[in-house]
């Protein structure tokens, strides 16, 4: 008789999840010499231990501490790029500007990027059928708690000028319910961070509006200012040209506004 299984509203664990995490770990540690000491089997065991046999709506940051410890990584604190709702461009940017880092350029972020996972209470099985949806089911699910934990630590590690890339095509350019708005903004350290510089990425080719004046950007400015961190905002009118100029800063067309 098939055992009754909880049906969640979200997609199930990504297929071949254990193999994917292990393979990513091996690849990352090969590419990044400073992480060569990491034992990927131990990383997978710690990852698995965070959610296997636990109710997928009752996961805590504490569950991920063994994984956090194994994945400890020193990122240059003045080279951090945060992003919200514009992941692809942020990653394209750090692929070109190699000395800057998004969360997904760190080991733990790289391991989990675009993956879903959850287990079941009291069984060692991974649930490939469904996992809790943050809105419809519960917020303390394995994926959400993981990203909250690593995002908090990443923001806490930042110093000097911190950049954030925001999507100017969205109705809420700054969304206080996003990971950036709900976690990272509140964990920047005012003693260490001088300025949060927002880069608002324009979508339309003919869009010449100053999106730094958008009400949601003013909201971000207010939150940051209350935390005694300076705020700065730039419009990136031409993201394609922006990337091109990062690649070739000597290009004569790169002196004008991007």
């Amino acid at each position: 008789v098939p055992r009754w299984r909880q049906q969640w509203s979200g997609p199930g664990t990504t297929k071949r999840f254990p193999e994917t995490v292990l393979a990513r770990c091996v690849k990352y540690t090969e590419i990044h010499p400073e992480m060569r000491h990491v034992d990927c089997q131990s990383v997978w065991d710690a990852f698995k231990g965070a959610f296997i046999s636990k109710h997928p709506c009752n996961i805590t940051e504490e569950d991920y501490q063994p994984l956090m410890k194994l994945g400890t990584q020193t990122v240059p604190c003045n080279k951090i790029l945060l992003w919200s709702r514009i992941k692809d461009l942020a990653h394209q940017f750090t692929q070109v500007q190699r000395d800057m880092f998004t969360l997904e350029d760190t080991l733990l972020g790289y391991l989990a990027d675009d993956l879903t996972w959850c287990g079941e209470f009291n069984t060692s099985k991974i649930n490939y059928q469904s996992c809790p949806d943050w809105r419809k089911d519960c917020s303390n699910n394995p994926v959400s708690v993981f990203w909250k934990t690593v995002s908090r630590r990443f923001a806490e590690a930042a110093c000097d000028v911190v950049h954030v890339m925001l999507n100017g095509s969205r109705s809420k350019i700054f969304d206080k319910n996003s990971t950036f708005g709900s976690v990272e903004v509140h964990n920047l350290q005012p003693e260490k961070v001088q300025t949060l510089e927002a880069w608002v990425i324009h979508g339309g080719r003919e869009d010449s509006r100053d999106l730094c004046q958008d009400p949601t950007i003013k909201e971000l400015e207010s939150i940051i200012s209350k935390r005694n961190i300076q705020f700065s905002c730039k419009n990136i009118y031409r993201p394609d040209k922006f990337l091109q100029c990062v690649k070739n800063p000597e290009d004569s067309s790169c002196t004008s506004e991007i």
Epitope: A157, D160, Q189, E191, K192, Q194, S232
Partner: antibody, heavy 114, light 111 residues
Framework: QIQLVQSGPELKKPGETVKISCKAS????????MNWVKQAPGKGLKWMGW????????TNADDFKGRFAFSLETSASTAYLQINNLKNEDMATYFC???????WGQGTLVTVSA | DIVLTQSPASLAVSLGQRTTISCRAS??????????MHWYQQKPGQPPKLLIY???NLESGIPARFSGSGSRTDFTLTINPVEADDVATYYC?????????FGSGTKLEIK
Amino acid sequence: QIQLVQSGPELKKPGETVKISCKASGYTFTNFGMNWVKQAPGKGLKWMGWINTYTGEPTNADDFKGRFAFSLETSASTAYLQINNLKNEDMATYFCARKGFAYWGQGTLVTVSA
Amino acid sequence: DIVLTQSPASLAVSLGQRTTISCRASESVDSYGNSFMHWYQQKPGQPPKLLIYRASNLESGIPARFSGSGSRTDFTLTINPVEADDVATYYCQQINEDPFTFGSGTKLEIK
């Protein structure tokens, strides 16, 4: 290039007020906070606090609360340190330094003498 | 407040020699693998000049004769080789937590 230029030396009597200026150039003034550091004659450096040049919010170290005020004139890219009710122990060189401490003003000597 | 203890208070070094200045913090000044310790050089009548930021990073324009090392509570500034122009007072400073504090200084002279 980035420069912080401070106002000239001051000779004051005990009980008087002094206001020192620090004019910034070569960068966007509101992007970086401004620190103030005290150095008594022949002594070491003491951090007094800083002012957020974007919001104008000052943060004073405990030893510099009360008589010490940080302020701004953003349109002139200038930060100010005002010391009220001067005491003999306020005699020192005062430095402004951009947040991050890579750029410093040349210092302003405040002499307090009856 | 974090107390920084610098040693020695003064030292005399021969030209061309290697010298080290130590700075010990009363508690860790590390955060997520970054050490928030700066080193400055100050000559009489001048403002301090940033030499090393975050423990081991050489500030632009500073000669490579200067280097910094250490983590958590123990930090070292090394000058190798010492030149006549290095006569000055050297300070460490922590910026890990408010209030930012300085060491008491080390005066370097030439033998």
